[in-house]
Each structure stands twice: as structure tokens, then as C-alpha cells.
Interface confidence: medium
């Protein structure tokens, strides 16, 4: 399994396009990938082509925040996926224990300096066919050929759905590195991205016990935030490696 | 390479006033949350206010609130601090610092002051 | 404000040694803990973030424990370039405040 990921790595590789002439740089993924329930992928990204020294990089899942990789401070995993995400290897990140769930588009976005932001795009397609394959034996010819008919139309839902989500909200980032809104339940993850009305605007500028004085109603959950985010020791991450 | 270069320093009366300003190269200034720190001779460090990576929001020490002023020139690189009604306790040397990313997480401090600069000495005395 | 308490104030260790810094904060700050080394007329370098988590580039002789209100900073074998003082910070509430310091020098 393992081994056919890092072929269809190999032979897959994309090159997402940027937003602005001034960036010279290239990210390369793994493109469009798929793999069985319950087993792990590693989602690969490369920033290629520039000599721009990479600050961060961020792991996105849609509108949720995965992982992020700081230069100074090394990993940190979102709490919500700690035990299913692992950082690594490299700037990659492995997801493990699959679920049809996390099927849906995964971004790259490395912030560097002095290009800006870099965005890279990846969709998983997560498959039961090992399940639905040994389950038909057990059923009548009739019912396994409508199972494996629910499953190709799911299949289709399915990225029908993930390509207009992809073209209602391409990602590919200026060179000024503005920050995609989040709603206001993401707001913890990137508190000082730009904010819908009503959100804490200024989350990131209060450590915990700092709510009362901010504006928002989210500020009672940003407050156990607080707390028990932090930084792993997970191993530095290894930026000079990536550009070249 | 990351450098943070302050400057403005040096003798000032009493009562007086003086800007500090501190030069930053090797990263996206207006990317980071950037902070003040100051240490008197044979003190420990004080901290005396942070300001969001786009100039929209401060912090300061409650003590220091109403003599000393924060703000940041995006187009210049610059950080500056404003310091009025200066009294002898305030000589120090003070440090620039990068606090951090501005969408990291929230806990990992209103500075992380990973880097410093060489920081520049205030003599406050008549 | 929260207060920090850290201790000792100084200390003589021979190189080789292995030494213990505590800093004790007046009310729990979880793990908003950060260590700072720092010597004669430079800046303070970070050591320690998250009470436990190295920095980049910092030997692995340095490391950090503890949570809440009582926390470590340890040095497993003293090197003649760790001789400085060390200073711990808490940045889970405004304002953030330092200790001390430890002035670590040889016997």
C-alpha cells in the first residue's frame, strides 16, 4: 500500500499554478490521491524554483486547520486530529485511520519570505472497496451489483461536490499573503485572520485569561484554547531542505 | 538572516521625551506580532507592550501604559517606541523583539521573542 | 500581575555538572512557560518554549519541565559557554512578566 502511495507520488506530481508573476516559485504535490478506509497516506507537498526562505507552513483541510510546521517553533497538531495525524516526513503529513469522512481537498500553504505565500492543492478520496468487495461474496449476485452502484454514485457525489467547492474557493494565495476568512468556530485556529462580524478579532493578541477585555462571544471558548495548545517537541522542521 | 537594529538612545533630563526606533530585515515585518523589553543595569527584563503585525492593536505593562506609546511603519520596517515624561527609574537598555507569526496559535505567547536585537541604552538623569 | 519566583538567584557549578533552575509562578499558567539564557551585554537568547520544548539550534543539555505554577530548567552537563543568567518567562496573561534571574558562574 505503502509503496503504490509513493509510485502514484512519484509519477503524480503537480505543479499549482500562482497568483502573481514576482513568484518565481512552484509547489509540487501529490495531486489527486486515494486510498482505503482505515489504512494512512502521506500528503507531500515542494516548494521548488525559488530561494525563498520558508517561515511557515500550514496544513489545511478545507476550513480546518491540520498541522502547522513553524520554523522557530517546530510542529504543532490541531488537538481535534492529534491522534490521527502525524507530522512528517519531511514538511509532509501522514493521516492515519482513514475515514470516507476525511475525503475532500487538503492544502499546502507555505509562507515564506520574500515571496509570500505559496499554495498547493491535494483531494483524497477515501474508498471502502475492500469492504465492499468482500462483503458482495456473502450476497446475492442482484444486491452486490447494487451495492457497487451506490458506491460508483457516491463516488461521483462525492467529487462532483469537492470540484465546485474547488472552484468556488480556488486557494492559490497573492504574493501579499493575505489569510482566507474562516468562520467563526476557526477563528481559535488562526485568531488573527481576517474576522466575520461578531468574531474575536483580536484573539491572538490575548494569552488566556485576557477574554473579558476582548469583543466577541467566542472568547469563552478561545480561553481553553488557550491552555492546551502548544507546540511539540516533534522535531525541528527542515526548511533549507525545501527550496532549491 | 533575521536583524532587529534599534537605535534612538541616549541621555535625556527628566520629564523629557525620546523615540526609540528599531530597523527590522530578513522577514516579512508586517507578518509579525513585534514587542518592547527593556532591562535596567543589573535588573531582570520588563516587558513593555507588543503591537499586532498590522499596527491595529496593543498591549502594554499597566505601569507603562500612559507615559509610553507603541507603533510600526510596515512600509519602512519599522517598529518605534515613545517614551514621555521619562523619570530616572526608566534607564535601561532597551531590547526589540519579534514576537510571532501572525496566524500561529494563540498559546504560543503574545511575544515569542525568538529574536532580539542588540538593543540601545537609555540614560535617564539631570 | 502574576509574580515569578526564581530561584537560586545565583549559583556555582563546575563544568560537567548537572543543574537545576526552578521558577514558581503566583497562580497557574499551564504550560505559558519560556527559558532565556543570557550573557554579558548581548541580547537574551530562547532556550525553553512551552515550559518543555527545546528551540531550534539548542543543545539537547538543556531541558524544561513541569506545569502550572512550578517549573525546571535543567542542564544536564554544564559547558564553560552555559556559564550566564538564565531568566523564565510566563506569557499566559498580560502583562507578561520575567524572574529574577539565575546567574549561573564557576566555582
Known amino acids: 500500500m505503502r509503496w503504490c502511495l509513493l509510485l502514484i507520488w512519484a509519477q503524480g506530481l503537480r505543479q499549482a499554478p500562482l497568483a502573481s508573476g514576482m513568484m518565481t516559485g512552484t509547489i509540487e504535490t501529490t495531486g489527486n490521491i486515494s486510498a482505503e478506509k482505515g489504512g494512512s497516506i502521506i500528503l507531500q507537498c515542494h516548494l521548488s524554483s525559488t530561494t525563498a526562505q520558508v517561515t511557515q507552513v500550514n496544513w489545511e483541510q478545507q476550513d480546518q486547520l491540520l498541522a502547522i510546521c513553524n520554523a522557530d517553533l517546530g510542529w504543532h497538531i490541531s488537538p481535534s486530529f492529534k491522534d490521527r495525524v502525524a507530522p512528517g516526513p519531511g514538511l509532509g503529513l501522514t493521516l492515519q485511520s482513514l475515514t470516507v469522512n476525511d475525503t475532500g481537498e487538503y492544502f499546502c500553504i507555505y509562507h515564506t519570505y520574500p515571496d509570500g505565500t505559496y499554495t498547493g492543492r491535494i483531494f483524497l478520496e477515501v474508498l471502502e472497496s475492500s469492504v465492499a468487495e468482500h462483503g458482495a461474496r456473502f450476497q446475492i449476485p442482484l444486491l452486490g451489483a447494487m451495492a457497487a452502484t451506490l458506491v460508483v454514485i457516491c463516488t461521483a457525489v462525492i467529487v462532483v461536490v469537492a470540484l465546485t467547492r474547488k472552484k468556488k474557493a480556488l486557494r492559490i494565495h497573492s504574493v501579499e499573503g493575505d489569510l482566507r476568512r474562516k468562520s467563526a468556530g476557526q477563528e481559535e485556529w488562526s485568531p488573527s485572520a481576517p474576522s466575520p462580524p461578531g468574531s474575536c478579532v483580536q484573539a491572538e493578541a490575548a494569552p488566556a485569561g485576557l477574554c473579558g477585555e476582548q469583543r466577541g462571544e467566542d472568547c469563552a471558548e478561545l480561553h481553553d484554547y488557550f491552555n492546551v495548545l502548544s507546540y511539540r517537541s516533534l522535531g525541528n522542521c527542515s526548511f533549507f531542505t525545501e527550496t532549491g | 538572516e533575521v536583524q532587529l537594529v534599534e537605535s534612538g538612545g541616549g541621555l535625556v533630563q527628566p520629564g523629557g521625551s525620546l523615540r526609540l526606533s528599531c530597523a527590522a530585515s530578513?522577514?516579512?515585518?508586517?507578518?509579525?506580532?513585534m514587542s518592547w523589553v527593556r532591562q535596567a543595569p543589573g535588573k531582570t527584563m520588563e516587558w513593555i507592550g507588543n503591537i499586532q503585525y498590522d499596527g491595529s492593536y496593543t498591549n502594554y505593562a499597566p505601569s507603562l501604559k500612559n507615559r509610553f506609546t507603541i507603533s510600526r511603519d510596515n512600509a519602512k520596517n519599522s517598529l518605534y517606541l515613545q517614551m514621555n515624561s521619562l523619570r530616572a527609574e526608566d534607564t535601561a537598555t532597551y531590547y526589540c523583539?519579534?514576537?510571532?507569526?501572525?496566524?500561529?496559535?494563540?498559546?504560543?505567547?503574545?511575544?515569542?521573542?525568538?529574536?532580539w536585537g542588540q538593543g540601545t541604552m537609555v540614560t535617564v538623569s539631570s | 500581575d502574576i509574580q515569578m519566583t526564581q530561584s537560586p538567584s545565583s549559583l556555582s557549578a563546575s563544568v560537567g555538572d548537572r543543574v537545576t533552575i526552578t521558577c514558581r509562578t503566583s497562580?497557574?499558567?499551564?504550560?505559558?512557560l519560556r527559558w532565556f539564557q543570557q550573557k554579558p551585554g548581548k541580547a537574551p537568547k530562547l532556550l525553553i518554549h512551552g515550559a518543555t520544548n527545546l528551540a531550534n539550534g539548542v543543545p539537547s543539555r538543556f531541558s524544561g519541565s513541569g506545569s502550572g505554577t512550578d517549573f525546571t530548567l535543567t542542564i544536564s552537563s554544564l559547558q564553560p559557554e552555559d556559564f550566564a543568567t538564565y531568566y523564565c518567562l510566563q506569557h499566559n496573561e498580560y502583562p507578561l512578566t520575567f524572574g529574577q534571574g539565575t546567574k549561573l558562574e564557576i566555582k
Open positions: 523583539t519579534r514576537g510571532h507569526f501572525r496566524i500561529t496559535m494563540a498559546s504560543m505567547g503574545a511575544s515569542a521573542s525568538v529574536y
Open positions: 530578513g522577514f516579512t515585518f508586517s507578518d509579525h506580532w
Open positions: 497562580q497557574d499558567i499551564g504550560n505559558s
